[in-house]
């Protein structure tokens, strides 16, 4: 992908609210461009924190001010609403509410929007078109919650505008403003090490790949030109500097490690794969 992010691209905001008891609560709000966090919410000052220099996209200061006020008011209102209806909805303290909402982009065009609310980690209600609908598995509590949420159609209209207009406008502006950052190519570094011994007479070989951007990467243990199907790829993990880290492991009999190599393919390498040979690997570490 030209922007260094995998299709479909999305922008979404997550709200995680923890209700410990009737009066003690806490919330975390964050904004994400696919898997890159671009915004957070400072609860103390009730302000949006822009985590990247380009996180404002092409929105004016005035629109940001209005959105900030909307989030501030809705956070207060949501907390109060959930607290008020907790008993009626049979929400038992302590409980957690997770909300995620945003929009998706496919081939440069908006392909849809979403807004979902979960109770205790399970799907509860979602926003479709212009109203809240319960997930069938969530039962009568969710139906009642939707009845409450759908009392104010004007608020639902604002929510609809946020999803169908604001979010698509924002994601396009964000991609444009962050183009240089998102299209950058950062070469990976790779090194080999021993993993914990899998058993007598066996070795675990570890190939570490770090500092690469964008995220898509191919890492494989090889014997000559033969891919080793036993290669176990870990999760691609984020680094603090916005690059990625991955490790690939392979378990082999001690005498079969000599002619193995780790091959790394990444867009930044422009076809010049990194190949590290286990036999050249220092046994220290």
């Amino acid at each position: 992908n030209a922007d260094g992010l995998k299709e479909p691209l999305s922008f979404h905001v997550t709200w995680i609210a923890s209700f410990y008891n009737h009066s003690w609560k806490q919330n975390l709000v964050s904004g994400w461009l696919s898997d890159l966090q671009t915004h957070t919410w400072d609860s103390n000052s009730s302000t949006i924190v822009f985590l990247c220099p380009w996180s404002r996209g092409n929105f004016s200061n005035e629109e940001w001010k209005e959105l900030e006020t909307l989030f501030r008011i809705r956070t207060i209102r949501s907390f109060e609403g959930i607290r008020r209806y907790a008993h009626e909805l049979q929400f038992e303290y302590p409980f957690e509410i997770q909300v995620t909402g945003g929009c998706e982009l496919h081939s440069g065009k908006v392909s849809g929007s979403f807004l979902q609310l979960a109770y205790q980690g399970s799907d509860f209600v979602s926003f479709q078109n212009n109203s809240w609908l319960p997930y069938p598995v969530a039962g009568n509590m969710a139906k009642h919650f939707c009845k409450v949420l759908n009392q104010n159609q004007h608020e639902n209209d604002i929510t609809h505008n946020l999803l169908s207009d604001t979010c698509p406008r924002f994601i396009l502006g964000l991609l444009d403003a962050g183009k240089a950052h998102l299209q950058r190519q950062v070469k990976p570094e790779a090194w080999l090490s021993h993993g914990p011994s899998p058993g007598p007479g066996h070795l675990q070989l570890v190939c570490h790949v770090s500092g690469f951007y964008p995220k898509p990467v191919w890492v494989m243990w090889m014997r000559g030109e033969q891919e080793q199907q036993g290669t176990q790829r870990g999760d691609i993990l984020p680094s603090a500097d916005g690059t990625w880290y991955l490790r690939a492991t392979l378990e082999v009999a001690a005498g079969e490690a000599a002619d193995l190599s780790c091959r790394v393919k990444h867009s930044s390498l422009e076809g010049q794969d990194i190949v590290l040979y286990w036999e050249h690997h220092s046994s220290v570490g």
């Epitope: 209005e66 008011i73 004007h154 608020e155 604002i158």
Partner: antibody
Framework: SVEESGGRLVTPGTPLTLTCTVS????????MSWVRQAPGKGLEWIGI?????TTYYASWAKGRFTISKTSTTVDLKITSPTTEDTATYFC?????????????WGPGTLVTVSS | AVEMTQTPASMSAAVGGTVTIKCQAS??????LAWYQQKPGQPPKLLIY???TLASGVPSRFKGSGSGTEYTLTISGVQCDDAATYYC????????????FGGGTEMVVE
Amino acid sequence: SVEESGGRLVTPGTPLTLTCTVSGFSLSSYAMSWVRQAPGKGLEWIGIISSSGTTYYASWAKGRFTISKTSTTVDLKITSPTTEDTATYFCARVDYYSSGWGGLWGPGTLVTVSS
Amino acid sequence: AVEMTQTPASMSAAVGGTVTIKCQASEDIYSNLAWYQQKPGQPPKLLIYGASTLASGVPSRFKGSGSGTEYTLTISGVQCDDAATYYCQCTYDTSSYGNTFGGGTEMVVE
């Protein structure tokens, strides 16, 4: 912009429809409110029509007023005016992300109810 | 419906001085409050929304604060042009509460 029209002298009980004509924005994206102000008195909120067309009224205004809209106009019908309905009627665009406040108001249209 | 009580009903202010207008809601409106300024023969002008956010083009001399049921509009460095009637408006829950206005505060500048 926002502009009200239709204000005039009417006799009590004669229905009257005020029209708010908008330009430069879409009524499918913005809610609109009606507010009135009797001579020398304060502002009184009558009701709102949401961008999707749902209407809400002040408790005192229910049954006395009806708000409706087309693609470029918002109407306020005073069903059976009384002398207490003599006022300047304002139409206001509710801000895009707003639960009710409005930054764009029309100049108002004067309705006088007298026999 | 929520009732909005505004105080004082009228006041006079000295040029350069600071004035405070209060608005009390009959129940918690969770910062869903706006302030307007209205001059004779004109429609109201939005000053503050969300209890404390300054509307576009409004001088920073105007400041909104408060939470729960108590809200305040403070005008510092009062100017002759500030002579007007000021209104608060509840914008909490349109469906249940309506967008009720306070009774207004008429401010004369001397």
